[in-house]
């Protein structure tokens, strides 16, 4: 007959390393008499015998986790008790190891040159994987611009064209290596003009070729603007090579002009644009007239469309960079200011401003603008818009104001030619001829000149006269 013997654990538990989905076994060999009852705990919580994830063999001396999960990590203890002496315990750790796994792989990226690009690469694993990157077939070297972040992501500051290519991240630990799929980094470059068109001074009727070269990723498109509008005549030839677009505009020159090359490319929903301009001048024009640099062309704007005569030629001043655009912008601004004036003044002022900014033009060898006749200018100032002008007297700025705030591009009446001196040297305002007939009340403004200076103005209805010395300042 055997003597009772308290349990002794002859094989203490050891630390067990196991990969996810692998088998993990703890052994707790016990010597005792009678045979002990052996129970197992994980993190001090009893493991139930009927839990199918576990196998308990050899009277409890072998505990096996049949398929290890992340959550099985912890401290496992066996407790042996046979009623003789005290219970004995031995503990060991289960360290769940994990081959590297890329949980957030990098994705294809399009980025604009000069910006910052981040390619994600989030990993899991135990031991914690180290992350490196491959570009093309070579290991990517970190530098002042390129860094692998703690998270594993690749950060590229100030992205350059040469950063474009195929990338993949590599996660590595002692248990293995994981590779992401190849992803593409595309570097987009804002449109940039490499070769601007050159200005030309040519004779009337010459052919001129303007050349504009631009680069960008994606390859830009090139459009041409003539004096602020789309080119209406001429032929365009384009060629593309190695992300460079070359555009040639051939023109038959009958008038001077400002030609703008506009290179545009698209980056997602946004566009980038680069511009370069060249002037084409006609030699005889510039020689014979230094003061009046400009050209005659049909008015193609919107603001004065209803005011100016249909198909009339108007003068565009080439001292502006984009004459047609610039003059249209001036009139547009003035138009907004006129919203504040009286219904009597407004149409008259509009007629004055449109005809002043877009003066009638005689083409000839030297394009000559025809100013408004002084009498019509004074009619607007002292008749139709007297109240508005009076309110502005004493101000330091020249022009019509709204609330004393905004300047309007109005002529200085006294400096304009009189229709009595040379009726062909100035422009009449037909609107005023028609409207003045219907005016029944006028502002009381004292003047030293007879009313006869205002064309066809009935003397009985006017209480003011025109003073040639009256300036608009």
């Amino acid at each position: 007959e055997k003597l009772p013997k308290a349990p002794v654990i002859t094989t203490p538990l050891e630390t067990v390393d196991a990969l996810v989905e692998e088998v993990a076994t703890f052994m707790c060999a016990v010597e005792s008499y009678p045979q002990p009852e052996i129970s197992w705990t994980r993190n001090k919580i009893l493991i139930k015998l009927f839990d199918t994830r576990y196998s308990i063999r050899e009277n409890g001396q072998l505990l096996t986790i049949l398929s290890v999960e992340d959550s099985d990590d912890g401290i496992y203890c066996c407790i042996a008790n046979n009623g003789v002496g005290g219970a004995v315990e031995s503990c060991g750790a289960l360290q769940v190891k994990m081959k590297p796994k890329i949980t957030r792989p990098p994705i294809n990226v399009k980025i604009i040159e000069g910006l910052k690009a981040v390619l994600p690469c989030t990993t899991m694993g135990n031991p914690k994987p180290s992350v490196s990157w491959i570009k093309g077939d070579n290991a990517l070297r970190e530098n002042s611009r390129i860094a692998v972040l703690e998270s594993g992501s690749l950060r590229i500051h100030n992205v350059q064209k040469e950063d474009a290519g195929q990338y993949r991240c590599v996660a590595k630990n002692s248990l293995g290596t994981a590779y992401s799929k190849l992803v593409k980094l595309e570097v987009e470059v804002f449109a940039r003009i490499l070769r601007a068109p050159e200005s030309h001074n040519v004779t009337f009727g010459s052919f001129v070729t303007l050349r504009c070269t631009a680069i960008g990723i994606p390859v830009p498109t090139i459009s041409w603007i003539e004096n602020g509008n789309a080119v209406s005549s001429g032929s365009i030839q384009e060629s593309v090579k190695d992300r460079v677009i070359d555009s040639r505009l051939q023109l038959f020159i009958t008038k001077p002009g400002l030609y703008t090359c506009i290179a545009t490319n698209k980056h997602g929903e946004k566009f980038s644009t680069a511009k370069a301009a060249a002037t084409v001048s006609i030699a005889e024009w510039s020689k014979s007239q230094k003061d009046s640099q400009g050209y005659c062309a049909q008015y193609r704007g919107e603001v004065c469309d209803a005011v100016l005569a249909k198909d009339a030629l108007v003068f565009f001043n080439t001292s502006y960079r984009d004459p047609e655009d610039a003059q249209e912008l001036l009139i547009h601004t003035a138009w907004n200011e006129l919203k504040a004036v009286s219904p009597l003044c407004r149409p008259a002022a509009e007629a004055l401003l449109c005809n002043h900014l877009f003066q009638e033009c005689s083409p000839g060898v030297v394009p000559t603008p025809m100013p408004i006749c002084r009498e019509y200018c004074l009619a607007v100032k002292e008749l139709f818009c007297a109240k508005e002008w009076q309110a502005m007297e004493g101000k330091a700025h020249r022009g019509l104001y709204r609330s004393g705030m905004h300047l309007l591009p109005v002529p200085e009446c006294s400096k304009l030619p009189s229709m009595h001196r040379d009726p062909t040297a100035c422009t009449r305002l037909p609107y005023l001829d028609y409207k003045k007939e219907n005016i029944t009340t006028f502002p009381s403004i004292t003047s030293s000149r007879p009313s006869a200076d205002i064309p066809n103005l009935p003397a009985s209805t006017s209480s003011f006269a025109v003073s040639p010395a009256y300036s608009m300042t």
Partner: antibody, heavy 121, light 107 residues
Framework: EVQLVESGGGLVKPGGSLRLSCAAS????????MDWVRQAPGKGLEWVSS????????YYADSVRGRFTISRDNAKNSLYLQMNSLRAEDTAVYYC??????????????WGQGTLVTVSS | DIQMTQSPSSLSASVGDRVTITCRAS??????VNWYQQKPGKAPKLLIY???TLQSGVPSRFSGSGSGTDFTLTISSLQPEDFATYYC?????????FGQGTKLEIK
Amino acid sequence: EVQLVESGGGLVKPGGSLRLSCAASGFTFSSYTMDWVRQAPGKGLEWVSSIGSNGDYIYYADSVRGRFTISRDNAKNSLYLQMNSLRAEDTAVYYCARGQLAVAGTHFDYWGQGTLVTVSS
Amino acid sequence: DIQMTQSPSSLSASVGDRVTITCRASQKVNKYVNWYQQKPGKAPKLLIYAASTLQSGVPSRFSGSGSGTDFTLTISSLQPEDFATYYCQQSYSPLSTFGQGTKLEIK
């Protein structure tokens, strides 16, 4: 002296059944895990099934699970393997073996002489 | 299941040679590996258990080593009676598995 003697082998048609027995002697049968291991002609060893000392746990190889049943009778010092739905690939010499717990897992320290099972039509 | 891969599958050697057979587990199995010898028409015989412990009655020219996934059985000086087939086995999982065997033949 420890002895394990298998019996019950023979020729059986595919789909048929057979019951193997293993008589143990020379040791306290009820204290040991017992296993069945088989060996197809000219092939290697293949573990088949295992049963705990008091029948508290039972395991099967994937290839036999659902068709074979292991059991023991500690009073008779006997181990059994009930084989149903037999297939040609079950043809083998079947050994019973005693499992011995050591400092690192169990090992088979004693084996029977084996019994041949032939499944053929 | 845990796979056990033995190499080589066959080996020719002469009496007195030192022979090494290796066994690799598909996952860590601690030291829960045993080695058996089998001669034609006979039951297998336990040589080594727990990776390196010599079974009682087995000659000391047999030795085992290894832990984790890689294990070796070494016969320091081959004797005529050692020509047989050798198997490794893991008992780390309750679903035990054997290696495919290494046949040791006389050169």
